[in-house]
C-alpha cells in the first residue's frame, strides 16, 4: 500500500499556556512526514502544519477562535516523497489526540507583580494583567478579559523578619492589605481558577520584598 514503513503518531499531547497552544507527538520521523487536522465537535476538520517533519504543531490560531469549544486534533502520517499514498483502509494512517477545551485546560502562566505601594498601614499590590492570543475586535484580550470573575489571585505575604505566611484573595488584579507600619514585607501571587478540575493554579510569581533596591514602585 506504500505505507509499509509509515508509523502512526503516538503520545499526542496538548501543551498550552495562556491559550498559546501546541500539539506535540512522537516519533521523530524517519522517511515520513506529518499533517495535522483540528476540529471542534462540528467535525469541520481543518488541516495545519502540512507535510512537516516537526513533531509539534502550533494550533493557537484555531483554538483562540472560541476558547470554550472542545477540540480534537489528529495527526496523519505519510511516506516522505509519496504523500498521496494511503493505508489499507484507503486513507493515511492517523491518530487522534485527547480532547482539549482551552478555557478549562490551558495552563495559567506564572503571574508577575507589576507594582506595590505602601501608605501607612495599607499595602496595595497590583498583578500585571497578562495578555493572551485571544482576540476580540482585533484586540488581544488579557487573562482577566477572558476569564472574568472565574479568575482569582491569591497573595501570600509575610514579614521579612518572620516566616509566618498570610494570604489574601481578590477577583480583580489588586490587593489592599493591612500591614504593620515600618515593617518590610515579602510577597508572591498565584493565579487560581477555582471552578476548574484540572490546572487550577499557576506557579507562584517571583517573590518581591519591600525595601530592596528595586524600590517601592515597579512598572
Amino acid at each position: 500500500s506504500g505505507t509499509t514503513n509509515t508509523v502512526a503518531a503516538y503520545n499526542l499531547t496538548w501543551k498550552s499556556t495562556n491559550f498559546k497552544t501546541i500539539l506535540e507527538w512522537e516519533p521523530k520521523p524517519v522517511n515520513q512526514v506529518y499533517t495535522v487536522q483540528i476540529s471542534t465537535k462540528s467535525g469541520d476538520w481543518k488541516s495545519k502544519c502540512f507535510y512537516t517533519t516537526d513533531t509539534e504543531c502550533d494550533l493557537t490560531d484555531e483554538i483562540v477562535k472560541d476558547v470554550k469549544q472542545t477540540y480534537l486534533a489528529r495527526v496523519f502520517s505519510y511516506p516522505a516523497g509519496n504523500v498521496e499514498s494511503t493505508g489499507s483502509a484507503g486513507e493515511p494512517l492517523y491518530e487522534n489526540s485527547p480532547e482539549f477545551t482551552p478555557y478549562l485546560e490551558t495552563n495559567i502562566g506564572q503571574p508577575v507583580i507589576q507594582k506595590y505601594e505602601q501608605g501607612g498601614t495599607k499595602l496595595k499590590v497590583t498583578v500585571k494583567d497578562s495578555f493572551t492570543l485571544v482576540r476580540r475586535n482585533n484586540t488581544f484580550l488579557s487573562l482577566r478579559d477572558v476569564f472574568g470573575k472565574d479568575l482569582i489571585y491569591t497573595l501570600y505575604y509575610w514579614k521579612s523578619s518572620s516566616s509566618g505566611k498570610k494570604t489574601a484573595k481578590t477577583n480583580t488584579n489588586e490587593f489592599l492589605i493591612d500591614v504593620d507600619k515600618g515593617e518590610n514585607y515579602c510577597f508572591s501571587v498565584q493565579a487560581v481558577i477555582p471552578s476548574r478540575t484540572v490546572n487550577r493554579k499557576s506557579t507562584d510569581s517571583p517573590v518581591e520584598c519591600m525595601g530592596q533596591e528595586k524600590g517601592e514602585f515597579r512598572e
Partner: antibody
Framework: EVQLLESGGGLVQPGGSLRLSCAAS????????MGWVRQAPGKGLEWVST????????YYADSVKGRFTISRDNSKNTLYLQMNSLRAEDTAVYYC???????????WGKGTTVTVSS | DIQMTQSPSTLSASVGDRVTITCRAS??????LAWYQQKPGKAPKLLIY???SLESGVPSRFSGSGSGTEFTLTISSLQPDDFATYYC????????FGGGTKVEIK
C-alpha cells in the same frame, strides 16, 4: 433537552425517491456533526452518512454512495437525507443522530421507517 | 473497511450477574470505540465512548475497557432494565458497527 425528530419515511417503489428530515432542538445545531444510521428489520445497525457542522464535509457508506445525499439547513436546525434509486435492501428504520466530531452518536432520534417494495 | 465482530451473539443471564461482552476489530482502532444499548422498538443509547469513557447519565455498573483490537463491555451487576441488545462501533476509519449481542433473561 436535546431532541431529534425524524420525518419523511413511508412506502416507496423500487427506483423511487424519498427525502427524510430531522428536526433538532435543545443544542446549537451548527456546532455538531450529524449523521444517519439505519436498521433493517431484525438486523443490526448500519451507518449511512455523516455531515459536518458547516455542511462542508460529507461521508457515505459504500452501500449508498451515489444514491443518497446528506445535507443540512443550519438556519432551520434541520438535517436531511435525500434517497434516490431506492432498493428493497434500503428498507429500514432510519435514525438521525448527533455525532460529535462525526465519530460517535451521543443523541438519537426515535427513527422513521422506510419501506421499499412494489 | 474495518470489521467489528461481537461475541457472543446471544447471552443468557440473571439479575445480579456480572456480564461481559467482547468486541474485536479487524485492525487496530486504538481506543476509538463506542458502546450502545438498544431495546426493542427503541433508538440506540450511547453508553461508552473512547473505549472506557462513561457517557453522562449512564449508571456506573457499565464499564468499557480495551484498546487496539480487543474491547469489552462489562455490566457489573445486571439489572432488570439491562436486558437489551448491545452494539459496539468503531470510529477510527469511517464508522462500522458490530453485529450486536442480545442479553436475555436466563
Amino acid at each position: 433537552e436535546v431532541q431529534l425528530l425524524e420525518s419523511g419515511g413511508g412506502l416507496v417503489q423500487p427506483g423511487g425517491s424519498l427525502r427524510l428530515s430531522c428536526a433538532a432542538s435543545g443544542f446549537t445545531f451548527s456546532d455538531y456533526a450529524m449523521g444517519w444510521v439505519r436498521q433493517a428489520p431484525g438486523k443490526g445497525l448500519e451507518w449511512v452518512s455523516t455531515i459536518s457542522g458547516s455542511g462542508g464535509l460529507t461521508y457515505y457508506a459504500d452501500s449508498v454512495k451515489g444514491r443518497f445525499t446528506i445535507s443540512r439547513d443550519n438556519s432551520k436546525n434541520t438535517l436531511y437525507l435525500q434517497m434516490n434509486s431506492l432498493r428493497a435492501e434500503d428498507t429500514a428504520v432510519y435514525y438521525c443522530a448527533k455525532a460529535p466530531y462525526g465519530y460517535y452518536m451521543d443523541v438519537w432520534g426515535k427513527g422513521t421507517t422506510v419501506t421499499v417494495s412494489s | 473497511d474495518i470489521q467489528m465482530t461481537q461475541s457472543p451473539s446471544t447471552l443468557s443471564a440473571s439479575v445480579g450477574d456480572r456480564v461481559t461482552i467482547t468486541c474485536r476489530a479487524s485492525q487496530s482502532i486504538s481506543s476509538w470505540l463506542a458502546w450502545y444499548q438498544q431495546k426493542p422498538g427503541k433508538a440506540p443509547k450511547l453508553l461508552i465512548y473512547k473505549a472506557s469513557s462513561l457517557e453522562s447519565g449512564v449508571p456506573s455498573r457499565f464499564s468499557g475497557s480495551g484498546s487496539g483490537t480487543e474491547f469489552t463491555l462489562t455490566i457489573s451487576s445486571l439489572q432488570p432494565d439491562d436486558f437489551a441488545t448491545y452494539y459496539c462501533q468503531q470510529y477510527k476509519s469511517y464508522i462500522t458497527f458490530g453485529g450486536g449481542t442480545k442479553v436475555e433473561i436466563k
